[in-house]
């Protein structure tokens, strides 16, 4: 099926993405029309080979006229008129650089194919994204329970059989030991030789049926064990490998995983099964203590079917010990992995076989790097000891679903000092940010004569001993989960893997989706692509090392990419989360495509954007206005920090902004929100309305109070003020009389504006760079 | 559960012979077979417990009918002799788990869950 055709059955949040990706610079009227031939041609070699564009963009037009011709044919009005806008429109635009529109049209259709790719793999993952957590069930999961119910079948009719083999057992027992009673076995030349006669042979032919059953019993055990390690195989390395993969995708912010009730209740029926197994494995042991024969099929193959159901239980059960919820500190419960020295975290472990006889059974004992003391110590880790309870008993009542699991609450670490400051070797080649470190939960369990040691681990966590770590942290954490599923790979940071940007741009979208209501768009994705990769068309399959994505500064910059946007998603979780959340903050956009954008709309239109080169994050708005002579010009205010958005929010500071002209008037150059929604509509009600911003005037006083609205105005006295951001300088109040301001008539008692600022205002224009 | 397949029913003249076939899905301690002629009630022929190797047989047969058992193919035999024109109905194996199969059993009064065959039609021709 064409790709286009393809879009249009996505989702409504897939397709929303989609309308993001088009725009006037190739508007989605074309790609529409003309879908075949544009997904035929080879746009990216025409983007890097301009002999090539130029013969595409010819073509592209004759195929604009073939179609404007059939339109002709079916006298469909609206299209031919819009298709011969969209003509007269790329000839303006592209007939001097016919690569650009190639540059455009290929990564179009590179994003497009992305967005298919997500949207496929989430329908993988367990259908509906927005509801992760639904329990659909896969054709792969039909067969598994088809095979469980296959084992637990042939587990019962085995039942019936060795019920069946110990009566004939005990009946030829019975008949042998009468003959021998009777001394029949001695009287063939008596009287009764020929009963005699007949009756050994009866008991002979007992004893063959006898011998066929026990060959039947013990074959058929054969065949079921090996059922059992299939569906072990498929529990344990799919199954649950699937469920851990999803567990390290949901702690870097990916879908949240599924439950893990039904691998438990999988997981226990096969161990259900594996016990009642042993138990007529042994009970072939007693059978063969009543009664063995030369050839006995017990005597041969009984120790090795023991051996098999033991291994398979034991192994089971070591699976089956999970960390159902990794370590998390709770007041970052969306960054679990990252621990800091005396700060309480958590963690939960669970076994995912449910037998009640297992309850209060099990002590859990945790403890940090277990098995790399003598490695830590040639790496120059750092050692750490668990305080806190770190021991507790599995049981079924603290969880809400009765299963049997221990959560440890009240844990927090401390460094083992050394004499050189806490590192074992003072040539640690890693940071203590790519130090990895694994919690490990240990436990035995007796259960049936047997003795099974458990034990598991957390997901590696960094440890930190100051907050201001965490970005790094946090990076390292997501880098790790991101490019292995290795689960104790400590080492991973001495050698750090290569990551693709397409592995990057769907974890850095994640990093805003799980804390706030929308990830990040395509369009968004690109200009993050084109800040870690530089200018290019496509993307996927491009490498970024693990440097450049949080250890190298970029270019012309102090800091790194991943403290920039850490930064940033930290300004929107805690200052504009709600116009965030709206999608009313374009956030990600370059200069050249913000331009593209804007100088097509009218004056007064407007975007919301981070800024690119404030280091602590900070957002900024720029906008479209008509200088003197009446050319367009695109202007940026200078970008807001969390220190301004803690004293006055953004929608306030967006719905208060003033400039002020040459004649001194203010005026409001932010009207329409990009494409054009009204200011208004979209900031209004985040703002407290003006009654509300003051108590009531004391009724007694003789006046009311002056009503004094913050509010941001920028000078514009100079020239030169094109693409250069404006500083923003805080009109200190505005004050309003009458009324308390309410719904006063000028005649009533006017209004009037007085204007102080809190800083001299300078003629000169804010410089600093976006 | 057991199941039963008879075969070997058939005409027989009277005085002839005639071998009814009855192989069990599994083993089970008691076999056995039972008749119903046209109007009357079931009633039991000869039953065969896996312990002792003794028959047992109602009145009417005995002397006549003999009743054995290959344990290795599950199965139960009838060898009918001198037939009599009363011997004609349809013959019904039947089996139990339990090994007590005697007269209790053939006279239908012991307890304890019986399995049967679908039945082989015996005509006696005189």
């Known amino acids: 099926m064409a790709q286009w055709n393809q879009l249009q059955q996505l989702d409504t949040r897939y397709l929303e993405q989609l309308h993001q990706l088009y725009s006037d610079s190739f508007p989605m009227e074309l790609r529409q029309f003309l879908a075949p031939w544009i997904e035929s041609q080879d746009w990216a070699y025409a983007a890097s080979k301009e002999s090539h564009a130029t013969l595409v963009f010819h073509n592209l037009l004759g195929e604009i006229d073939q179609q404007y011709s059939r339109f002709l044919q079916e006298s469909n009005v609206l299209y031919q008129h819009n298709l011969r806008r969209i003509k007269q429109f790329l000839q303006s635009r592209y007939l001097e650089k016919p690569m650009e529109i190639a540059r455009i049209v290929a990564r179009c259709l590179w994003e497009e194919s992305r967005l298919l790719q997500t949207a496929a793999t989430a329908a993988q993952q367990g259908g509906q994204a927005n509801h992760p957590t639904a329990a659909v069930v896969t054709e792969k999961q039909q067969m598994l329970e088809q095979h469980l119910q296959d084992v637990r079948k042939r587990v019962q009719d085995l039942e019936q059989k060795m019920k069946v083999v110990e009566n004939l057992q005990d009946d030829f027992d019975f008949n042998y030991k009468t003959l021998k009673s009777q001394g029949d076995m001695q009287d063939l030349n008596g009287n009764n030789q020929s009963v005699t006669r007949q009756k050994m042979q009866q008991l002979e032919q007992m004893l063959t049926a006898l011998d066929q059953m026990r060959r039947s019993i013990v074959s058929e055990l054969a065949g079921l064990l090996s059922a059992m390690e299939y569906v072990q195989k498929t529990l344990t390395d799919e199954e649950l490998a699937d469920w851990k993969r999803r567990q390290q995708i949901a702690c870097i912010g990916g879908p949240p995983n599924i439950c893990l009730d039904r691998l438990e209740n999988w997981i226990t029926s096969l161990a259900e099964s594996q016990l009642q197994t042993r138990q007529q494995i042994k009970k072939l042991e007693e059978l063969q203590q009543k009664v063995s024969y030369k050839g006995d099929p017990i005597v041969q193959h009984r120790p090795m079917l023991e051996e098999r159901i033991v291994e398979l239980f034991r192994n089971l059960m070591k699976s089956a010990f999970v960390v159902e919820r990794q370590p998390c500190m709770p007041m970052h419960p969306d960054r679990p992995l990252v621990i800091k020295t005396g700060v309480q975290f958590t963690t939960k472990v669970r076994l995912l076989v449910k037998f009640p006889e297992l309850n209060y059974q099990l002590k859990i004992k945790v403890c940090i790097d277990k098995d790399s003391g003598d490695v830590a110590a040639l790496r120059g880790s750092r050692k750490f000891n668990i305080l806190g309870t770190n021991t507790k008993v599995m049981n079924m009542e603290e969880s809400n679903n009765g299963s049997l699991s221990a959560e440890f609450k009240h844990l927090t670490l401390r460094e083992q000092r050394c004499g050189n400051g806490g590192r074992a070797n003072c040539d640690a080649s890693l940071i203590v940010t790519e130090e990895l470190h694994l919690i490990t939960f240990e436990t035995e369990v007796y259960h049936q004569g047997l003795k099974i040691d458990l034990e598991t681990h957390s997901l590696p966590v960094v440890v930190i001993s100051n907050i201001c770590q965490m970005p790094n942290a946090w990076a390292s954490i997501l880098w790790y989960n991101m490019l292995t599923n290795n689960p104790k790979n400590v080492n991973f940071f001495t050698k750090p893997p290569i990551g693709t940007w397409d592995q990057v741009a769907e974890v850095l979208s994640w990093q805003f989706s799980s804390t706030t209501k929308r990830g990040l768009s395509i369009e968004q994705l690109t200009t993050l692509a084109e800040k870690l990769l530089g200018p290019g068309v496509n993307y996927s399959g491009c490498q970024i090392t693990w440097a450049k994505f949080c250890k190298e500064n970029m270019a012309g910059k102090g800091f790194s990419f991943w403290v920039w946007l850490d930064n940033i998603i930290d300004l929107v979780k805690k200052y504009i989360l709600a116009l965030w959340n709206e999608g009313y903050i374009m956030g990600f956009i370059s200069k050249e495509r913000e331009r593209a954008i804007l100088s097509t709309k009218p004056p007064g239109t407007f975007l919301l954007r981070f800024s690119e080169s404030s280091k602590e994050g900070g957002v900024t708005f720029t906008w479209v206005e008509k200088d003197i002579s009446g050319k367009t010009q695109i202007q940026s205010v200078e970008p807001y920090t969390k220190q301004q958005l803690n004293n006055m929010s953004f929608a306030e500071i967006i719905m208060g902004y003033k400039i002020m002209d040459a004649t001194n008037i203010l005026v409001s150059p932010l009207v329409y929100l990009y494409p054009d929604i009204p200011k208004e509509e979209a900031f209004g009600k985040y703002c407290r309305p003006e009654s509300q911003e003051h108590p009531e005037a004391d009724p007694g006083s003789a006046a009311p109070y002056l009503k004094t609205k913050f509010i941001c105005v920028t000078p514009t006295t100079c020239s030169n003020t094109i693409d250069l951001p404006m500083s923003p300088r805080t009109l200190d109040s505005l004050m309003q009389f009458g009324n308390n301001g309410e719904g006063a008539e000028p005649s009533a008692g006017g209004q009037f504006e007085s204007l102080t600022f809190d800083m001299e205002l300078t003629s000169e224009c804010a410089t600093s760079p976006m | 559960h057991v199941q039963l397949v008879e075969s070997g029913g058939g005409s027989v003249q009277a005085g002839g012979s005639l071998r009814l076939s009855c192989v069990a899905s599994?083993?089970?301690?008691?076999m056995g077979w039972f008749r119903q002629a046209p109007g009357k009630e079931r009633e039991g022929v000869a039953a065969l417990s896996s312990r002792g190797f003794a028959g047992h047989y109602t009145d009417s047969v005995k002397g006549r009918f003999s009743i054995s058992r290959d344990y290795v193919k599950n199965a139960v035999y009838l060898q009918m002799n001198t037939v009599k024109p009363e011997d004609a109905a349809m013959y019904y194996c039947?089996?139990?788990?339990?090994?007590?199969?005697?007269?209790?059993?053939?006279?239908?009064?012991?307890?304890?869950?019986?399995?049967w065959g679908q039945g082989t039609q015996v005509t006696v021709s005189s």
């Open positions: 599994t083993y089970t301690g008691c």
């Open positions: 039947a089996a139990r788990e339990g090994w007590e199969c005697g007269e209790t059993w053939l006279d239908r009064t012991a307890g304890g869950h019986t399995y």
